[in-house]
């Protein structure tokens, strides 16, 4: 049997050591003990008695099926306890009585059906994070379960086999910053929603089939809900159930953010909310985020005209990796308040983007992200976006463009352009002179000779440049990142010629440690202020004698330098 490894600060690692019991020889010097992924099965009353100063105890996935009632009696300083993914079929309040300092408790993934006969947590007055439940057996949430808990930062409940929810069970917790509910069906959703309205600021619903969700008015008085964010992850919706879900929003008037991740819409976007919902809901929602939305019939997807008015006040929309190939013109025109639009990892080509960025589209848009789409012509892209009079920031990275032409048109307010990972070999005057930030990293550039009078930040890492670009090209440059190129040297004159340069990141280049370079680095201790990752990323490539040495440490031979 292997032993624990402990460092000087009392952090002990015993993960995956095939322990069959809590190891002996534990001491009061231990602050953190990780015994996860072992075969411990049993924790006796004296096993941890020496650990009076233990703050962190991790016993994840250690096959524990029995814990004596007083096993944790000496752990008054314990702040973090992880008992997840074990074989505990029942939970005992006596375990937690002594743990008055506990801030984090994870009981998830154990095969209990309820949270014990009596309330488990009345003494845990400092608890901030609680994770409970499991996939198969946890079937009942009762009123006594959360007694004593008044405020939590995070509460996660995995109740995919929930068969009974006792009304008001969650109501006793007055303040929950982030509640994550794993529910397979929507059967108890309305009851739970009513109980958490006045306490939860961020509700996350996971793995829930909402296809049969039907709204009915909640039995609540006028309530001022603090809920600001609502997220659905791995949920299944239909056009009809989406309409029903919208009705919940009338109870959470402060909601500002809605998120859908990894959801499936078994529908066509033929939403038909009632008139009252259209008028009143989404009142303060400013941010809508959709990632990896699966629509089996996405070629038949509607233009969302039935919810246009719902979205008129939204300021930030992300629809990422969801097979979007066209945003209808009329939809774009209705997004009147939209300032930020991210359509990363979709299927947009310029010719269909033209339809989306039609006259009057996205009139307030400042930032557009079209990273990793199917754009092919920089010239066409710029031209199509001329309709966006307020666009200042454009990210068209990770598209594979044809060679850059000499001239292009761009929205006149554009200040930021991301062309990273686009396969470009040469930069030409197609790039607008108005830019303040340009990212051309991870391309095939072996030179950069473009005059950009307003440029403040240049990101040109992971290219093939052999020298720093000429400073006269960027009179107001503040930041240059040029790591992982083929730069062999830089000099006092070169750096001095960038009058405003505050940050230079030039590590991981192929430095030739000449007498000039080494004497410059030795004479200029202030390099540490300007060079990011100095000195560790600045290594000699040649001469062979100095290969792999840090520039800071390399010493030229007297003979070489005085010839």
């Amino acid at each position: 049997q292997e032993s624990l490894s402990c460092d000087a600060s009392g952090v002990c690692d015993g993960r995956s050591r095939s322990f069959t019991s809590i190891p002996s020889g534990l001491t009061a010097a231990m602050k953190s003990l990780d015994l996860s992924f072992n075969k411990i099965t049993y924790i006796g009353h004296g096993d941890l008695r020496a650990c009076a100063n233990l703050q962190v105890l991790m016993l994840k996935s250690s096959r524990i099926n029995t814990i004596e009632g007083d096993a944790f009696y000496s752990l008054g300083s314990l702040e973090h306890l992880d008992l997840s993914d074990n074989h505990l079929s029942s939970l005992s309040s006596s375990w937690f009585g002594p743990l008055s300092s506990l801030k984090y408790l994870n009981l998830m993934g154990n095969p209990y059906q309820t949270l014990g006969v009596t309330s488990l947590f009345p003494n845990l007055t400092n608890l901030q994070t609680l994770r409970i439940g499991n996939v198969e057996t946890f079937s009942e949430i009762r009123r006594i379960d959360f007694a004593g808990l008044t405020s939590l930062n995070e509460l996660e409940i995995k109740a995919l086999s929930l068969r009974n929810y006792q009304s008001q069970s969650l109501k006793s917790i007055r303040d929950i910053h982030h509640l994550t509910l794993h529910l397979s069906e929507s059967a108890f959703l309305l009851e739970i929603f009513a109980d958490i309205l006045s306490s939860v600021r961020y509700l996350e619903l996971r793995d829930t089939n909402l296809a049969r969700f039907q709204f009915s008015p909640l039995p609540v008085d006028e309530v001022s809900s603090p809920m600001k964010k609502l997220a659905f992850r791995g949920s299944v919706l239909t056009d009809e159930s989406f309409n029903e879900l919208l009705k919940l929003l009338r109870y959470i008037l402060e909601l500002s953010e809605v998120e859908f991740d990894d959801c499936t819409l078994n529908g066509l976007g033929d939403f038909n909310p009632s008139e009252s919902d259209v008028v009143s809901e989404l009142g303060k929602v400013e941010t809508v985020t959709i990632r990896r939305l699966h629509i089996p019939q996405f070629y038949l997807f509607y233009d969302l005209s039935t919810v246009y008015s719902l979205l008129e006040k939204v300021k930030r929309i992300t629809v990422e990796n969801s097979k979007v190939f066209l945003v209808p013109c009329s939809f774009s025109q209705h997004l009147k308040s939209l300032e930020f639009l991210d359509l990363s990892e979709n299927l947009m080509v310029e010719e269909y983007l033209k339809n989306s960025a039609c006259k009057g589209a996205w009139p307030s848009l400042q930032t557009l992200v079209l990273s990793q789409n199917h754009l092919r012509s920089m010239q066409k892209t710029g031209e199509i976006l001329l309709t966006l009079k307020n666009l200042t920031s454009l990210d068209i990275s990770r598209n594979t463009f044809h060679p850059m032409p000499d001239s292009c048109q761009w929205p006149e307010k554009m200040r930021f352009l991301n062309l990273s990972s686009t396969g470009i070999r040469v930069v030409k005057t197609c790039i607008p002179q108005t830019l303040e930030v340009l990212d051309v990293s991870n391309n095939n550039l072996d030179s950069f000779s473009l005059f950009l009078p307003r440029l403040q930040e240049l990101y040109i890492s992971r290219n093939k440049l052999k020298t720093l670009p000429d400073a006269s090209l960027f009179p107001v440059l503040l930041v240059m990142k040029i790591r992982e190129n083929a730069v062999s040297t830089f000099s006092k004159d070169q750096l001095g010629s960038f009058p405003k340069l505050e940050t230079l990141e030039a590590g991981d280049n192929h430095f030739v440690c000449s007498c000039e370079l080494l004497s410059f680095t030795m004479e200029t201790p202030a390099l540490a202020q300007i060079l990011v990752d100095w000195p560790d990323s600045y290594l000699c490539d040649s001469p062979p004698r100095l290969h792999g040495h840090r520039l800071q440490d390399a010493r030229p031979s007297v003979l070489e330098c005085h010839q």
Partner: antibody, heavy 118, light 111 residues
């Protein structure tokens, strides 16, 4: 440059299965869909189905739904199409093609001839 | 399924003449202002080659004598001055509804 290279000709007996491959290069494989289209001798083109390598999602022509399976190996930038319960009417040239903009096929493989004969 | 009917079946032209190929869909292939109709050229023993997408957008690298037009259900491919290298089959294809379908083709030959 973008290339789709397909596996060689196949001669199969009725009732057998055939698995065709399509190796992609010159572009980010997971960013595009891969379609399969077939052309019987002297006939027009018939769409079989597509796959999006990024998430593995597929869609099929109902005529092939029960017999065709489309898969990918993203690490090898290769798409596969397996057709089972072959019959003589399946004798055709099978093409893979890259799907751009969600709607058009801008690069095609050279085609694989499948002959089904007893 | 959307049925695409191409006409004529064969088009026989002299070099320099204008070719007009037609494709009619059994229902509209419009998708919110964009016609999801493509045209492909196929020469004997070769795979099809994309010429036009979205009804009127000429694919990069395709000679500018090729143009596409139309909306709804009626689409046209024009070759302004036919050249010897333009012989082959021309297919239209819709991607408005699954299953995607191709027309039966028009054969272009030089007299």
């Amino acid at each position: 440059q973008v290339q789709l290279v397909q596996s060689g000709s196949e001669l199969k007996k009725p009732g057998a299965s055939v698995k065709l491959s399509c190796k992609a290069s010159g572009f980010t494989f997971t960013t595009y869909g891969i379609n399969w289209v077939r052309q019987a001798p002297g006939q027009g083109l018939e769409w079989i189905g597509w796959i999006y390598p990024r998430d593995g999602s597929t869609n099929f022509n109902e005529n092939f739904k029960d017999r065709a399976t489309i898969t990918v190996d993203t690490s090898a930038s290769t798409a596969y199409m397996e057709l089972s319960s072959l019959r003589s009417e399946d004798t055709a040239v099978y093409f893979c093609a890259r799907l751009t903009g969600g709607t058009f096929l801008d690069y095609w493989g050279q085609g694989t001839t499948v002959t089904v004969s007893s | 399924d959307i049925v695409l009917t191409q006409s004529p079946a064969t088009l026989s032209l002299s070099p320099g003449e204008r070719a007009t190929l037609s494709c009619r869909a059994s229902e509209s292939v419009e998708y919110y202002g964009t016609s999801l109709m493509q045209w492909y050229q196929q020469k004997p023993g070769q795979p099809p080659k994309l010429l036009i997408f979205g009804a009127s957008n000429v694919e990069s690298g395709v000679p500018d004598r090729f143009s596409g037009s139309g909306s709804g259900t009626d689409f046209t491919l024009k070759i302004s001055r036919v050249e010897a290298e333009d012989v082959g089959m021309y297919f239209c294809q819709q991607s408005r509804k699954l299953p995607w379908t191709f027309g039966g083709g028009t054969k272009v030959e030089i007299k």
